[in-house]
């Protein structure tokens, strides 16, 4: 922003009435009037160039400084070419001399030179020559000076001439300030240039109604330089959370719009399945039935609860049930939906019924689910299970209704067998089982499967109809992972537990041993 | 849940040695073998051999004799595959794998460790 | 060694159509035992394969029922009722009948 200058001296536009002192007086300077464009001009003027040895001073009046801390001072002059005097004037000059002193009173006219300092020698670019002059064309030049810091009340300058021809059309005293000045919505007060020209006087601005600085942001600072430019901004003001920027103001957001927070986007319209929003809304609150999860941002259209899984069945294979489902029709509009298995199980016989998850096994965690299948392992026999397959997404947890689907199962499967060890020998082992006589009639084989711990790459399996089994050919001094598994006419039965035996080693006796019961 | 998870990515230079790690988590390591696969770039499967993870007792396959060594620490549940004298033939991904819920097949698998030997 | 041959090395399908993967062992997959350890895995970009189908035709835990497996002795199938664009990637056939181990070349499942 260009600086704005503020006058304290206009000897141009005074129309002669400022009196300045000279000195000596009556000698020297004088004060002339002439007539340009049908406008009287003014203009202090001497040309004693013929006689040698001049000091003569024209002082101004005594200048209040006010806020000025540093004065510019713009001289327009003319200056006769010393060649156009007969002779050449030997002692003639080209220059004058500018000077300034501060004083916190009006001296009136006692005038001492003494008091007063050299600002600097004022010499013309331009001089006038004699055919300048007589065609009444005068070379205007015009020179400007500065000083600074100020301090006292206020000041005169004095123009002391050494023998020159000189005419002092225009003398303006100014100083500058930083014009008041609205940028990055933040306020910044007319502020008065510094004194020291390599300093810059850092100036704080404050946010326009409405606008904020945002957090972690720089407050708004701009630097007021000595021409009074405005340089180096530093920071910048948002507008608040329910306002836009328009122009250099901040605005309520329309009726039907939102900002949620201090940012330079604009107001954005209410999403989907929310409420008209008054005018400066930072939000806009869902429609009835539709929520906003804590994570959701805020331009995100409110949403709701899944239905219930559209799909679900249950497959019982031997001890286990698969579960298979199809995801619900409305997801709620969000896509973030999880599903959680429970299980519930009841004897027929009683009728009692309770939860199941300690004792099945999920091939998966049943909780927080993304696939829509689920294999449920380790099922009792002769029981009814009663599986839940709820869906929920983020919003869930804002309503107390569930949105679940049912689906039972009953296990015809036989228990597990009972294996033990009847004796072992350095290259087999002599295995029996059990299961309740009430199942027994439901089996037709059982199958052995039996392998090296340590090695699931390869295994064995023996088929049979009885209850024990001598599997040999095995090595020596070595631990089997041994399985007895019942097979009925629906396929598998359940499994035992894998159980760990260990031949003999050759030092042992090579004879059957036999294990006590 | 039952996790093979094994070491990062290696670059090694002809001659050299390399060790790569295979570490078991979820169901007991001792009980189920470990079986080690190749596949080089864009390339298939090839199987290289299997160690009992009880008795450390490993098995290669002839292609893979010599220069390969599979090995057990089984405190840490951790398989080894060690490479002697590389070759830029053995610049491939690595995979552990073994029949854990089903036997005699490859039902768990590593995440895989690429190896690239180049001078 | 037991050779796994699949072909085509890629098979172009659109989303919603029903793909067919075969694959054949230079000698049969039967067990002494009875069983055949023939066995799918699907490989992703970047990813460990993962097993799909095992002993010819039984799914692994959590695979989606639009895979199934079929074949005996030494041709075998894997099929993909309607593609989704999740099973895109390259399928293996696997033998572990037969020490060593052995693998298909793969069949890359892409877009049409």
């Known amino acids: 922003a260009q600086g704005k200058e503020v006058v304290l001296l206009d000897f141009a536009a005074a129309g002669g009435e400022l009196g300045w002192l000279t000195h000596p007086y009556g000698k020297g300077w004088d004060l002339m009037q002439n007539i340009m464009n049908d406008m009287p001009i003014y203009m202090y003027s001497v040309c004693n160039v013929m006689s040698g040895d001049q000091d003569n001073w024209l002082r101004t009046n005594w200048v209040y400084r006010g806020e000025a801390e540093r004065i510019f001072i713009e001289l327009k002059f003319t200056v006769r070419d010393c060649n156009s005097f007969p002779g050449g004037a030997s002692s003639c000059k080209e220059t004058f001399n500018l000077y300034y002193a501060e004083s916190d009173l009006d001296y009136g006219t006692n005038f001492q030179k003494r008091l007063f300092t050299k600002i600097d020698t004022i010499a013309p670019d331009e001089i006038t020559v004699s055919s300048d002059f007589e065609a009444r064309h005068v070379k205007l030049n015009v020179e400007e000076r500065s000083v600074g810091p100020l301090t006292r009340k206020g000041f005169y300058l004095a123009f002391q001439d050494i023998g020159a021809c000189v005419a002092l059309l225009s003398v303006r005293v100014y100083y500058k300030k930083c014009p008041e000045l609205l940028q990055g919505l933040a306020h910044f007060p007319e502020t008065i240039a510094g004194s020291d020209a390599p300093s810059l006087a850092t100036v704080a601005g404050t946010c326009v109604d409405h606008a904020v600085v945002p957090p972690g942001g720089e407050e708004p600072r701009m630097h007021c330089a000595v021409d009074g430019e405005w340089l180096v901004p530093i920071g910048q003001c948002l507008c608040q959370a329910g306002y836009e920027k328009v122009e250099d103001a901040c605005q309520a957001c329309s009726p039907g719009f939102f900002k949620f927070e201090a940012s330079e986007s604009p107001c954005l319209e209410c999403p989907e399945h929310t409420l008209p929003s008054p005018e400066g809304a930072t939000s806009c609150e869902c429609e009835e039935g539709f929520f906003r999860a804590p994570q959701d941002p805020a331009s995100m259209p409110c949403t709701r609860p899944p239905s219930a899984p559209h799909y679900l069945t249950a497959v019982g294979m031997g001890a286990k049930v698969e579960l298979r489902w199809t995801p619900p029709q409305d997801s709620g509009g969000r896509e973030d939906i999880v599903y959680s298995v429970t299980c519930e199980q009841c004897w027929p016989e009683s009728g009692e019924c309770g939860p199941c998850e300690a004792s099945v096994r999920y091939s998966e965690p049943p909780h927080g689910l993304t696939r829509t299948s689920v294999t449920v392992s380790d099922l009792e026999p002769h029981m009814n299970y009663t599986f839940t397959v709820e869906a929920r997404n983020g919003v869930s947890g804002l309503v107390t209704s569930r949105s679940f689907r049912t689906a039972s199962v009953s296990i015809n499967q036989t228990e597990p067998p009972k294996v033990r060890l009847e004796g072992r020998s350095t290259t087999s082992l002599s295995v029996s089982w059990s299961i309740p006589p009430p199942q027994q009639s439901r089996v037709w084989k059982y199958e052995v499967t039996y392998r090296k711990k340590g090695d699931s790459n390869s295994y064995n399996v023996r088929r049979t109809e009885g209850f024990s089994v001598t599997l040999d050919d095995l090595a020596p001094d070595t631990t089997y992972l041994v399985q007895v598994q019942a097979l009925t006419q629906e396929g598998q039965g359940a499994g035992s537990k894998v159980h760990e035996f260990q031949t003999l080693s050759p030092e042992g006796s090579g004879n059957l041993a036999v294990i006590g019961g | 849940q039952i996790q093979l998870v094994q070491s990062g990515p290696e670059l090694k230079k002809p001659g050299e040695t390399v060790k790569i790690s295979c570490k078991a988590s979820?169901?007991?390591?001792?009980?189920?073998?470990m079986n080690w696969v190749k596949q080089a770039p864009g390339k298939g499967l090839k199987w290289m051999g299997w160690?009992?993870?009880?008795?450390?007792?490993?098995t290669y396959a002839d292609d893979f004799k010599g220069r390969f060594a599979f090995s057990l620490e089984t405190s840490a549940s951790t398989a080894y595959l060690q490479i002697n004298n590389l070759k830029n033939e053995d610049t491939a991904t690595y995979f552990c794998?073994?029949?854990?819920?089903?036997?005699?097949?490859?039902?768990?698998w590593g995440q895989g460790t690429t190896l690239t030997v180049s001078s | 060694d037991v050779v796994m041959t699949q072909t085509p090395l890629s098979l172009p399908v659109s989303l919603g159509d029903q793909a067919s993967i075969p694959c054949r062992s230079s000698?049969?997959?039967?067990?002494?035992?009875?069983?055949?350890?023939l066995h799918w895995y699907l490989q992703k970009p970047g990813q460990s394969p993962k097993l799909l189908i095992y002993?010819?035709?039984n799914r692994f835990s959590g695979v989606p029922d639009r895979f199934s497996g079929s074949g005996s002795g030494t041709d075998f199938t894997l099929k993909i009722s309607r593609v989704e664009a999740e099973d895109l990637g390259v399928y293996f056939c696997?033998?572990?009948?037969?020490?060593?181990?052995?693998f298909g070349g793969g069949t890359k499942l892409e877009i049409k």
């Open positions: 002993k010819v035709s």
């Open positions: 000698q049969s997959l039967v067990h002494s035992n009875g069983n055949t350890y």
């Open positions: 979820g169901y007991t390591f001792t009980d189920y073998s």
């Open positions: 160690i009992n993870t009880y008795t450390g007792e490993p």
């Open positions: 794998a073994s029949p854990i819920s089903l036997l005699r097949l490859l039902d768990y």
């Open positions: 696997s033998q572990s009948t037969h020490v060593p181990w052995t």
